[in-house]
Interface confidence: low
């Protein structure tokens, strides 16, 4: 091991403060006590350290906590978080939502980095499920977060968390993901009345089975074409012309513009021409 340089007389840091920005890297290494740094991590962010100086501070923490940092330090990492590798983060055990928020704030406005992805993965695994508060937090920082999860990961979302999901959070979800989320949403919103229920469930209908679509067609919901186009083809095919007409209400005219696209194309091919003609849209089966 390389012999450590001694701290020059009078330069031992009694606390983490602005004077340290004038220390050379070797002076920071020699003169800043790691345990002091750990208890005053919250001050590091307020001091304009260079990237090189932050590297030294990280090294000191790594020496103090070779098996990973305690959450009391992690919560105050601030910009030092950007210096962490996914390997560093895998050693952590983050359980406090405040800690998660503090670190996501540091990365705000940027794409989800490998560090952030690892942090979120550690956090969610530690909690055992994606509870509502966590989901609220993650979707606020990363609206596409939910759709980045595998169906297996989504299965850990409890129905109560679905209340935190906004329509835009589901924009990039594929049918396999909606298949997992829809039954949870159905359970979460089951006590709402017809029109309120439809407003809430609408974004999840890409996972709905035929029988639920049939039930909705009896409730004057006036589904828009954008929602209809996201429905599962296998769920739409068994619907009758009358049921689709009731489901779409005044939006039924939009079928003409979508007649070459799935699921409308496949549905049209399954219908009797006489039934299609009752719509008066010139749809050809």
């Amino acid at each position: 091991e390389v012999e450590k340089t001694a701290c020059p007389s009078g330069k031992k840091a009694p606390e983490i403060d602005e004077s340290l920005i004038f220390y050379k890297k070797w002076e920071l290494e020699a003169c800043v006590d790691a345990a002091l740094l750990a208890t005053q991590m919250d001050r590091v962010n307020a001091i304009p350290f260079t990237y090189e100086q932050l590297d030294v501070l990280k090294h000191k923490l790594d020496e103090l906590y070779p098996q990973g940092y305690p959450e009391s330090v992690i919560q105050h990492l601030g910009y030092l978080f950007l210096k962490m590798s996914p390997e560093d983060i895998r050693k952590w055990n983050v359980t406090s939502l405040e800690t998660l928020k503090a670190l996501l704030e540091v990365n705000k406005g940027h794409e989800m980095s490998p560090q952030v992805a690892t942090l979120i993965d550690r956090f969610v695994k530690g909690r055992g499920q994606l509870d509502k508060d966590t989901l609220d937090t993650l979707t606020a920082f990363y609206p596409g977060y939910l759709c980045s999860l595998s169906p297996e990961e989504l299965s850990s979302v409890p129905p109560s968390s679905i209340w935190a999901v906004r329509p835009q959070d589901l924009d990039t979800c594929d049918p396999r993901q909606l298949d997992v989320l829809y039954p949870k949403a159905r359970l979460a919103f089951q006590n709402m009345n017809g029109s309120e229920y439809f407003v809430k469930i609408q974004s999840f209908l890409g996972g709905a089975p035929t029988e639920d679509l049939k039930a909705l067609s009896q409730q004057n919901v006036s589904m828009d074409l954008a929602t209809f186009m996201k429905l599962r083809t296998d769920a739409v095919l068994p619907l009758t012309v009358a049921e689709v007409q009731k489901l779409l209400g005044p939006h039924v005219e939009g079928l003409k513009a979508e007649e070459r696209h799935r699921p409308v194309r496949d549905w049209i091919l399954r219908q009797r021409q006489d039934d299609l003609d009752t719509l008066g849209l010139g749809l050809q089966g």
Epitope: D17, A38, T39, D42, Q67, P70, E71, S72, Q75, N93
Partner: antibody
Framework: DVQLQESGPGMVKPSQSLSLTCTVT?????????WHWIRHFPGNKLEWMGY???????NYNPSLKSRISITHDTSKNHFFLKLKSVTTEDTATYYC????????WGQGTTLTVSS | DIVMTQSQKFMSTSVGDRVSITCKAS??????VAWYQQKPGQSPKALIH???NRHTGVPDRFTGSGSGTDFTLTISNVQSEDLADYFC?????????FGGGTKLEIK
């Protein structure tokens, strides 16, 4: 030398709110550290309640989250604990303390919740 | 929450003896543990942190050791003024949690 001193009412009735003050001398609460409230129950159990950091951010024990609020008055170098809807279960000695593995503790103030 | 267990509620020792007080964490807390001494009628006093560093002014007869889930506070050459409650704290995760305490009695 850093010193912390708790002050409060000594007795509170059930369902009322409890307010405690921690006066810090010898160190500015805006200079660093987390500033904690911890309580010690009669049966010898210690419970961490939460903290306010030098910058004003807070973190609370989830078991108390709906009832607890920690604030500070930086001009007076004080920080405060407010606990709503107290019950006899909140009878304890309340300590304020500095730092993550707290290095300085106040003398404690005993609170009895009784009608 | 992480549970910190001090299985010995009371320990009896004599002046000059060496005594070890143990603390077990319900999960791996690495080295994020501190030890405190509380004498009758006084507030807790920080002894050891991380988990083998003595706080300023703490006599060197107090030593801490351990990592992961098992931690020990050792007092060598016990003095009569060491009569007190001793408890551990983990700060690896929030909420911070304490052990139930071990009361050291001097024969």
């Amino acid at each position: 030398d850093v010193q912390l001193q708790e002050s409060g009412p000594g007795m509170v009735k059930p369902s009322q709110s409890l307010s405690l003050t921690c006066t810090v001398t010898g160190y500015s609460i805006t200079s660093g550290y987390d500033w904690h409230w911890i309580r010690h129950f009669p049966g010898n159990k210690l419970e961490w309640m939460g903290y306010i950091s030098y910058s004003g951010s807070t973190n609370y024990n989830p078991s108390l989250k709906s009832r607890i609020s920690i604030t500070h008055d930086t001009s007076k170098n004080h920080f405060f604990l407010k606990l709503k809807s107290v019950t006899t279960e909140d009878t304890a000695t309340y300590y304020c303390a500095r730092g993550t593995g707290p290095d300085y503790w106040g003398q404690g103030t005993t609170l009895t919740v009784s009608s | 929450d992480i549970v910190m267990t001090q299985s010995q509620k009371f320990m009896s020792t004599s002046v000059g003896d060496r005594v070890s007080i143990t603390c077990k964490a319900s999960q791996n807390v690495r080295t994020a543990v501190a030890w405190y001494q509380q004498k009758p009628g006084q507030s807790p006093k920080a002894l050891i942190h991380l988990p083998s560093n003595r706080h300023t002014g703490v006599p060197d007869r107090f030593t801490g050791s351990g990592s992961g889930t098992d931690f020990t506070l050792t007092i060598s050459n016990v003095q009569s003024e060491d009569l007190a409650d001793y408890f551990c704290l983990q700060h690896w995760n929030y909420p911070l949690t304490f052990g139930g305490g071990t009361k050291l009695e001097i024969k």
